[in-house]
């Protein structure tokens, strides 16, 4: 694969990833289709830094991050290991809630409008970041 | 200057097979998603398909998914669309295009196209 | 899948004259949205992208407006050479939909 060193144009770089915001929402799927042509991937939450860092720039507004229970337990889509990882879950979440009476539960997680995380409806229109890291040969990612 | 050159297409058999390929030069090949797109006779423009930059990444149009494979060789500059069971309606004119940036950017370069013709 | 709508599928008009060709699309598609001119036996030309912004080394007298599911090419003041065929896309969502074309010709 090709190593990136530098972010793309409209990317922000940011300890040696790169994000990019987007200005509309689309459904998770949509959203992680968008960024994989991109050869990126749904936002990765590593750490309470880059917790800050993403919540900042997409100020109050809820937003997809790459981590999902679609197939059963949660996972992030670039496989960093969701048990032992950085979590910011709001209390009481995930509930996987069947309430909102849109089919099935709630697989799909996102930023919220405090920054903390919740799962929701996966078709849900929400804005998206996609991440990319650089001096990484880029590589296929790995399959839902 | 920034160029892409197709090649590959001619007359086959409806439930043949081609390979077109597009030669790109002028610009970090590898950096940039790239995009099949092909227009039947007399018709309009018709998306085929899309792969990312690192080849990781690959999209389909409907009418084509399941018999038409996109892919890449960064290190020769060259993007592939290969087709199998050609049908009389896949007959048109096949360009490669260059996305401005981003993937999802408009299509800033394209081929001069080749012409492919399903036909017994 | 968005699919594009454009109207006039096709359209007389004589130099001088201001021309408008619209472009709907079935969902919301932002600001990824572009026109293309295409002439015969050539390969298309990308005109405006994002929905507003001039490709460098367009004429001025093309301009793009519109955003979510309504867009608008709008041609000043035709020129000999702009009569050709223009065709809307959207690359917001793969598959990345053109609209069936505007036939552009002389009255």
């Known amino acids: 694969g090709s190593e990136r060193t530098c972010c793309p144009v409209n990317w922000v770089e940011h300890e040696r990833s790169c994000y990019w915001f987007s200005r509309s929402g689309k459904a998770w799927a949509d959203a992680d289709n968008y960024c994989r042509l991109e050869d990126a991937h749904l936002v990765v939450v590593t750490s309470w830094e880059e917790q800050k860092f993403v919540q900042h720039h997409i100020g109050p507004v809820n937003t997809w991050m790459g981590l999902h229970d679609q197939n059963g337990p949660w996972k992030w889509v670039d496989g960093t290991d969701y048990e032992t990882g950085f979590k910011n879950w709001r209390p009481e979440q995930p509930d996987d809630w069947y309430g909102h009476g849109l089919g099935g539960g709630e697989d799909c997680a996102h930023f919220t409008d405090d920054g903390r995380w919740n799962d929701d409806v996966c078709q849900r229109p929400y804005r998206w970041v996609c991440e990319t890291e650089l001096d990484k040969a880029s590589q296929e990612p790995p399959l839902l | 200057e920034v160029q892409l050159l197709e090649s590959g297409g001619g007359l086959v058999q409806p439930g043949g097979s081609l390979r077109l390929s597009c030669a790109a030069s002028?610009?970090?090949?590898?950096?940039?998603?790239m995009n099949w797109v092909r227009q039947a006779p007399g018709k309009g423009l018709e998306w085929v398909s899309a792969?990312?930059?690192?080849?990781?990444?690959?999209y389909y149009a409907d009418s084509v998914k399941g018999r038409f494979t996109i892919s890449r060789d960064n290190s020769k500059n060259t993007l592939y669309l290969q087709m199998n069971s050609l049908r009389a309606e896949d007959t048109a004119v096949y360009y490669c295009?260059?996305?401005?940036?981003?993937?999802?950017?408009?299509?800033?370069?394209w081929g001069q196209g080749t012409m492919v013709t399903v036909s017994s | 899948d968005i699919q594009m709508t454009q109207s006039p599928s096709s359209l007389s008009a004589s130099v001088g004259d201001r021309v408008t060709i619209t472009c709907r699309a079935s969902?919301?598609?932002?600001?990824?949205l572009n026109w293309y001119q295409q002439k015969p036996g050539k390969a298309p030309k990308v005109l405006i992208f994002?929905?507003?912004s001039l490709k460098s080394g367009v004429p001025s007298r093309f301009s793009g407006s519109g955003s979510g599911t309504d867009f608008t090419l709008t041609i000043s003041s035709l020129e000999p050479e702009d009569f050709a065929t223009y065709f809307c896309?959207?690359?917001?969502?793969?598959?990345?939909?053109f609209g069936q074309g505007t036939r552009l010709e002389i009255k």
């Open positions: 295009a260059k996305p401005l940036v981003g993937a999802h950017d408009a299509f800033e370069i």
């Open positions: 896309q959207q690359s917001y969502s793969t598959p990345f939909t």
């Open positions: 994002a929905a507003s």
């Open positions: 969902q919301y598609s932002s600001d990824y």
């Open positions: 002028g610009f970090t090949f590898s950096s940039y998603a």
């Open positions: 792969i990312s930059g690192s080849g990781g990444a690959t």
